[in-house]
């Protein structure tokens, strides 16, 4: 018969490394008479027996984790007690060895230029992982501005443009790697103008082109302001290049103005301006020049606007003390005296009254005003208006004018200058260039003058010309 | 036939003063913008100076304060007075009628400074 | 001063044959208000005075024959001689209207 003989634990616990989800064993061997009980303990609390995530076999002896988690990492210990002498127990640790593993990815990030970015990357991993970030395929190195945290986040200082891209963090131990998706830093620059538009003093009438160009992310918007509110007339032409949008006005010059430019973008609810102004001034023009007698400018009224080109510039009688006003005055008065006149005349004297009293400017020294042809009168006075002419010269001598119809707008034919003389001098009359080119008979003309004088407009192959070359001085 | 005669060309010693004249013919002188434009030995052509129909006158810098366009519509005449002349201002002086084109050219009067 | 850049300096050609001389201004010479281009060109015979050839880029003046015409726009003009003749030999100067005037510095043209 065996004596009794109090437990000895012959192999102590060691200290055990698992992986998470394998298998841990902890061997208790004990050698005692009669056989032990042999209880298990983690962190001194009681593992019972029928806890399914562990096996205990060999009467105790075998304690096996069937599938590790990393929360069962602690001291396990066994105690085995017979009833002979005092329970022994012997405790070893588990050390739950963990791949890495990337609890917290970055994320995408929008951020504006010059401000702090930091990009997450939380672990879990035994051994603790490293943590390294790549941008593009290229490991990003650490400076003064960019540093990887403890934690492992990505904070980058003073976001610069050349910042944006694709990152991802890899976390590493010796049990391997873990990488988190790509993520993408956006960086968000404020609507900066590369070049500003550049004053121009300019002759008058003449097109400028103002330039400019700002960049941005996202890129910018342009706008132009001229004299504080939006450009009314000129065409802009944009261009977009590498995050640099290129600007230009073309515009008309008649008047001095203050343009700005103003670039603008959004960073999320807020947006960024930036702003740049460039005057346009008109270049001095000579003393003599404003001693003449009036400016020039953009015809705005509405009589002579069929008549008159688009956009035409007009001289206006600076004798009047508004002359724009005064002249549509004249003009809206003199209309009003040619409802009486025939069809074929009436169009006629619109044409030659409008160019009379808006005369069009042309440029050289300066912008000034040009007459119409003497050619182009004659031919209103002498055929297309003979018999209304020759009315009104009979009122007129009569004195029947007095109530300040005299100042009726009708030019002096014999005191303009001919095309022939220079074909530069004076305007011409387009109306009349069409009409002389489509009428083929001509009521009976009761000339003031004999027929002789009768125009002979340039290049007539009508019945229009129904004189020989008219000789004029 | 429209006819401009220049005459009052000369030489001249440097710092002189010479005054050029130009009789038009041919045409209503007083509806007219008048020219001078000179041309210097082999040179090219250079514009002086523009007289408009109110006797308003206009100047290339290079002679400005120098040199005074006038007209005269009753004699229809135009004259162009050349003051404080220097070496450079050597040059064939042409009376031009024209307003935007320089239509109808004199046959020019020399002018020569040189002392 | 708009500065008017003319090119070549000289051309030899013989009769028949057709001529282009070009003439380059420094800033746009055509006028917003009426498109007009403000450029002239001018024919100067030995020992004669300059007579207008061409106005406004493209209009003739009157008595100047049909083989010349002039053309272009903006800044770049061309007069054109179609069929050269003895008589054309001279020198041709462009000039400028849209500011103070200004000519470029002319082309001799030889008939061989």
């Known amino acids: 018969e065996k004596l009794p003989k109090a437990p000895v634990i012959t192999t102590p616990l060691e200290t055990v490394d698992a992986l998470v989800e394998e298998v841990a064993t902890f061997m208790c061997a004990v050698e005692s008479y009669p056989q032990p009980e042999i209880s298990w303990t983690r962190n001194k609390i009681l593992i019972k027996l029928f806890d399914t995530r562990y096996s205990i076999r060999e009467n105790g002896q075998l304690l096996t984790i069937l599938s590790v988690e990393d929360s069962d990492d602690g001291i396990y210990c066994c105690i085995a007690n017979n009833g002979v002498g005092g329970a022994v127990e012997s405790c070893g640790a588990l050390q739950v060895k963990m791949k890495p593993k990337i609890t917290r990815p970055p994320i995408n990030v929008k951020i504006i230029e010059g401000l702090k970015a930091v990009l997450p990357c939380t672990t879990m991993g035994n051994p603790k992982p490293s943590v390294s970030w790549i941008k593009g395929d290229n490991a990003l190195r650490e400076n003064s501005r960019i540093a990887v945290l403890e934690s492992g986040s990505l904070r980058i200082h003073n976001v610069q443009k050349e910042d944006a891209g694709q990152y991802r963090c890899v976390a590493k131990n010796s049990l391997g790697t873990a990488y988190s998706k790509l993520v993408k830093l956006e960086v968000e620059v404020f609507a900066r103008i590369l070049r500003a538009p550049e004053s121009h003093n300019v002759t008058f009438g003449s097109f400028v082109t103002l330039r400019c160009t700002a960049i941005g992310i996202p890129v910018p918007t342009i706008s132009w302001i001229e004299n504080g509110n939006a450009v009314s007339s000129g065409s802009i032409q944009e261009s977009v290049k590498d995050r640099v949008i290129d600007s230009r006005l073309q515009l008309f010059i008649t008047k001095p103005g203050l343009y700005t430019c103003i670039a603008t973008n959004k960073h999320g609810e807020k947006f960024s301006t930036a702003k740049a102004a460039a005057t346009v001034s008109i270049a001095e023009w000579s003393k003599s020049q404003k001693d003449s007698q009036g400016y020039c400018a953009q015809y705005r009224g509405e009589v002579c606007d069929a008549v008159l080109a688009k956009d035409a510039l007009v001289f206006f009688n600076t004798s009047y003390r508004d002359p724009e006003d005064a002249q549509e005055l004249l003009i809206h008065t003199a209309w009003n005296e040619l409802k009486a006149v025939s069809p074929l005349c009436r169009p006629a004297a619109e044409a030659l009254l409008c160019n009379h009293l808006f005369q069009e400017c042309s440029p050289g020294v300066v912008p000034t005003p040009m007459p119409i042809c003497r050619e182009y009168c004659l031919a209103v006075k002498e055929l297309f208006c003979a018999k209304e002419w020759q009315a009104m010269e009979g009122k007129a001598h009569r004195g029947l004018y007095r109530s300040g119809m005299h100042l009726l707008p009708v030019p002096e034919c014999s005191k303009l200058p001919s095309m022939h003389r220079d074909p530069t001098a004076c305007t011409r009359l387009p109306y009349l260039d069409y009409k002389k080119e489509n009428i083929t008979t001509f009521p009976s003309i009761t000339s003031s003058r004999p027929s002789a004088d009768i125009p002979n407009l340039p290049a007539s192959t009508s019945s229009f010309a129904v004189s020989p070359a008219y000789s004029m001085t | 036939e429209v006819q401009l005669v220049e005459s009052g060309g000369g030489l001249v010693q440097p710092g002189g003063s010479l005054s050029l004249s130009c009789v038009a013919s041919g045409f209503t002188f007083s509806l007219y913008y008048m020219n001078w434009v000179r041309q210097a030995p082999g040179k090219g052509l250079e514009w002086l100076s523009v007289i408009d129909t109110h006797s308003i006158a206009y100047y290339a810098d290079s002679v400005k304060g120098r040199f005074t366009i006038s007209r005269d519509n009753v004699k229809n005449t135009l004259y162009l007075q050349l003051n404080n002349l220097k070496p450079e201002d050597t040059a064939l002086y042409y009376c031009v009628l024209g307003r935007t084109a320089l239509v109808r050219w004199g046959q020019g009067t020399q002018v020569t400074v040189s002392s | 001063d708009i500065v008017m850049t003319q090119s070549p300096s000289s051309v030899t050609a013989s009769v028949g044959e057709k001529v282009t001389i070009n003439c380059k201004s420094s800033q746009s010479v055509v006028f917003g208000s009426n498109q007009k281009s403000y450029l002239n060109w001018y024919q100067q015979r030995p020992g004669q005075s300059p007579r207008l050839l061409i106005y406004?880029?493209?209009t003739q003046e009157s008595g100047i024959p049909d083989r010349f015409s002039g053309s272009g726009s903006t800044t770049d003009f061309t007069l054109t001689i179609s069929s050269v003749q003895p008589e054309d030999a001279a020198v041709y100067y462009c000039?400028?209207?849209?500011?103070?005037?200004?000519f470029g510095s002319g082309t001799r043209l030889e008939i061989k």
């Open positions: 000039q400028q209207a849209y500011s103070a005037p200004t």
């Open positions: 406004y880029a493209s």
